[in-house]
């Protein structure tokens, strides 16, 4: 199963929408969210600290989309019209990772395994779910 | 120097509105977040919400959900804290704070606090 | 809400003394908590982010440690400007939540 693909089998029995409680993903586009997210956390708390880690390399604008990519894995968007959590979709991810990966690299960090792009949906569209870019970011 | 300048101290009866500001100076206002902090008299500290000046974007404690609005006037680097229908377990220094990198590190600068007496 | 206790609640101690607060989380919050010092009738101070990060300005005798669930505030020697409150905090996630404070007086 592709991260964000829709599966109406999997809606059933799916957790509601919850209010984004993550300090780092206020003000992103959107606040409702799912536990689990596409990273395996089952708490909003056990994913904001782990996401906080990120925190020096979002302050250092390697890319300006990567609070919105990052929230969108730790905290993917909610609706009630989808069952699935909804990441970002891969062109951005990849994006991400060509600017940010090198700023880690300085400072002997590797791009996490747990972020890999191939993982995404290519692009949005009714059998696999992604978000943009926001315009505004 | 970084200061946060708070207005002075007021009394309200129950059921009315007290609104509170808060001037920053000595940093980029628009880049870090200000919190809004209460003391009841003899306790603890108790977050009341968070507010973003650079899109107005606000966070708030469950608690004072639909009674606390935060808004700020850019052109004066100010941010209000409007609590209503006051009740005497309102009454309580309020202080402001500013807030780095989404909160993650503390609050590194607050404001001398804004006493709310609530009384009949 | 991320519920945070503190112990003890009060203590006596005298000038010189190693003085150890102690702050839980009801849940991991990872190393995200603040310490602040606050004296009567003024503002909260910041003294540790991130559990052990000194604030520029604090003096070196504040020290911090833990992760996930328990952490410490240590004064490794008690000075007379340091009788105080002290309070956590989380910064986790929303809503931030305090400590109730640990009073620190004299002996």
């Known amino acids: 199963l592709e991260i964000g693909r829709f599966d109406p089998e999997r809606g059933r029995g799916a957790a509601p929408c919850q209010a984004v409680e993550i300090p780092m993903c206020r003000g992103i586009g959107y606040n409702l969210t799912r536990m689990p997210n596409l990273l395996g956390h089952t708490s909003q708390g056990e994913a904001a600290a782990e996401l906080a880690e990120f925190a020096p390399l979002v302050q250092y604008g390697c890319h300006s989309h990567l609070r919105f990519f990052l929230c969108s894995l730790y905290a993917p968007m909610c609706t009630d019209q989808v069952s699935t959590p909804i990441p970002a979709c891969r062109p951005m991810c990849e994006q991400a990772r060509l600017r940010c990966a090198p700023i880690m690299e300085q400072f002997n960090f590797g791009w996490p395994d747990s972020l890999d792009c191939a993982r995404l949906p290519t692009r949005n569209d009714p059998h696999a779910l992604c978000m943009e870019a926001p315009e505004n970011a | 120097q970084v200061q946060l300048v708070q207005s002075g101290a007021e009394v309200k009866k129950p059921g009315a509105s007290v609104k509170v500001s808060c001037k920053a100076s000595?940093?980029?206002?628009?880049?870090?977040?200000i919190n809004w902090v209460r003391q009841a008299p003899g306790q603890g500290l108790e977050w009341m919400g968070g507010f973003d000046p650079e899109d107005g974007e606000t966070i708030y404690a469950q608690k004072f959900q639909g009674r606390v609005t935060m808004t700020r006037d850019t052109s004066t680097s100010t941010v209000y804290m409007e609590l209503s229908s006051l009740r005497s377990e309102d009454t309580a220094v309020y202080y402001c704070a500013k807030a780095g990198d989404w909160g993650l590190y503390g609050m590194d600068v607050w404001g001398q606090g804004t006493m709310v007496t609530v009384s009949s | 809400d991320i519920q945070m206790t503190q112990s003890p609640s009060s203590l006596s101690a005298s000038v010189g003394d190693r003085v150890t607060i102690t702050c839980r989380a009801s849940?991991?919050?990872?190393?995200?908590l603040a310490w602040y010092q606050q004296k009567p009738g003024k503002a909260p101070k910041l003294l540790i982010y991130?559990?052990?990060s000194l604030q520029s300005g604090v003096p070196s005798r504040f020290s911090g440690s833990g992760s996930g669930t328990d952490f410490t505030l240590t004064i490794s020697s008690l000075q007379p400007e340091d009788f105080a409150t002290y309070y956590c905090?989380?910064?986790?996630?929303?809503?931030?939540?305090f400590g109730p404070g640990t009073k620190v007086d004299i002996k």
């Open positions: 991130a559990a052990s």
């Open positions: 849940q991991s919050i990872s190393r995200w």
């Open positions: 905090q989380q910064t986790n996630t929303f809503p931030f939540t």
């Open positions: 000595g940093y980029t206002f628009t880049s870090y977040d």
